[in-house]
Interface confidence: low
């Protein structure tokens, strides 16, 4: 009786179990009663990453420089190309199909975590005692100047966006 199911790395065709093609190869012809499955390696710009019966290999992903992408890992006959973003950019999705510039932290916010090729800048509000007066993708919140250590007094309070303004001690009037 013809099989209704086949072993691992086999497939059922014409009531017969044929071997699948190994990763990196595509199917040219199914096996017969007298011949084994015929497979051919994928060409240089193509891949297949599983045991398969595909008649066409998949094209390697193109890391389009027009979209800010660059090759992180070149594809092989068994693996797809992995794209990442150029410096200053990060992927818009897990599949990294396009890139956007790293977000800058606005004044009043500092960088908690610097962006990478796959993740955006993480900003945090500057807590009391700290400030940021710039829009930046890498600057953390900076501490207010300590007037006391300079033998000065606070003349203007600091905010999350501005440093304190220090000045001399009250002088005696003449």
């Amino acid at each position: 009786e013809p099989p209704t199911a086949c072993r691992e790395k086999q497939y059922l065709i014409n009531s017969q179990c044929c071997s699948l093609c190994q990763p990196g190869q595509k199917l040219v012809s199914d096996c017969t009663e007298f011949t084994e499955t015929e497979c051919l390696p994928c060409s240089e710009s193509e891949f297949l990453d599983t045991w398969n019966r595909e008649t066409r290999c998949h094209q390697h992903k193109y890391c389009d420089p027009n979209l800010g992408l660059q090759v992180q890992q070149k594809g092989t006959s068994e693996t797809d190309t992995i794209c990442t973003c150029e410096e200053g950019l990060h992927c818009t999705s897990e599949s990294c199909e396009s890139c956007v510039p790293h977000r800058s932290c606005l004044p009043g916010f500092g960088v908690k975590q610097i962006a990478t090729g796959v993740s955006d800048t993480i900003c945090e509000p500057c807590p009391v005692g700290f400030f940021s007066n710039v829009s930046s993708a890498f600057e953390k919140c900076r501490p207010w100047t300590s007037c006391e250590t300079k033998d000065l007094v606070v003349q203007q309070a600091g905010t999350n966006k501005t440093d304190v303004v220090c000045g001399p001690q009250d002088r005696q009037r003449a």
Partner: antibody, heavy 126, light 112 residues
Framework: QVQLVESGGGVVQPGRSLRLSCAAS????????MHWVRQAPGKGLEWVAV????????YHADSVKGRFTISRDNSKNALYLQMNSLRVEDTAVYYC???????????????????WGQGTTVTVSS | DIVLTQSPLSLPVTPGEPASISCRSS???????????LDWYLQKPGQSPQLLIY???NRASGVPDRFSGSGSGTDFTLKISRLEAEDVGVYYC?????????FGQGTKVEIK
């Protein structure tokens, strides 16, 4: 100012080789992808090849694949096109072209082939 | 490869009159980010080509506002609102969505 100047063209017999050069000035060459585009006498524009800014990605038109090779030397601000096994149908003016890019609505995108050289003429004839 | 078809191939225009060139693509040039990857170039007599419009409708730096690009997907149009003598030459559309880049056959604009 931003400029691309091609050189290396000339008259050559079929089957011979030629190497075109393109000298870039007035911009940060290593930040831009570069193309070669050609134009046969009295004909339209035909794309030949592209190379990414670091030279890691190269693509060639089917009509020249296996015969022409695009390359670059960022330390010399230079783009090259090595042309081997030349054919009569390769006769054309060859342009060196910069692929522009900029931020568009928050995305980093292509903004046209924005700088073209004056072209260098290659004549393949027996 | 993507095939671009321009029409008309020749366009005689009276100075001061408008002109319109069509470019049709064999497949959509609209990328998933909403941009149409189509450019327009002008090659004036005896000169190198120059960029007019990129991403379908964006005028390149220094290009007069009488030039405008429109369209989406497979159908694109370049319009010149009032033709000037310096606008004569051959206009090409080019797709930038895929490698190989491909150009239209060109439209020759001349003074009537």
């Amino acid at each position: 100012q931003v400029q691309l100047v091609e050189s290396g063209g000339g008259v050559v017999q079929p089957g011979r080789s030629l190497r075109l050069s393109c000298a870039a000035s007035g911009f940060t060459f290593s930040s831009y992808g570069m193309h070669w585009v050609r134009q046969a006498p009295g004909k339209g524009l035909e794309w030949v090849a592209v190379i990414s800014k670091d030279g890691g990605n190269k693509y060639h038109a089917d009509s020249v694949k296996g015969r022409f090779t695009i390359s670059r030397d960022n330390s010399k601000n230079a783009l090259y096109l090595q042309m081997n096994s030349l054919r009569v149908e390769d006769t054309a003016v060859y342009y060196c072209v910069r692929r522009g890019h900029q931020l568009v609505l928050g995305y980093y995108y292509y903004n046209g082939l924005d700088v073209w050289g004056q072209g260098t003429t290659v004549t393949v004839s027996s | 490869d993507i095939v671009l078809t321009q029409s008309p191939l020749s366009l005689p225009v009276t100075p001061g009159e408008p002109a319109s060139i069509s470019c049709r693509s064999s497949q959509s040039l609209l990328y998933s980010n909403g941009y149409n990857f189509l450019d327009w170039y002008l090659q004036k007599p005896g000169q190198s080509p120059q960029l007019l419009i990129y991403l379908g409708s964006n005028r390149a730096s220094g290009v007069p506002d009488r030039f405008s690009g429109s369209g989406s997907g497979t159908d694109f149009t370049l319009k010149i609102s009032r033709l000037e003598a310096e606008d004569v030459g051959v206009y090409y559309c080019m797709q930038a969505l895929q490698t190989p880049r491909t150009f239209g056959q060109g439209t020759k604009v001349e003074i009537k």
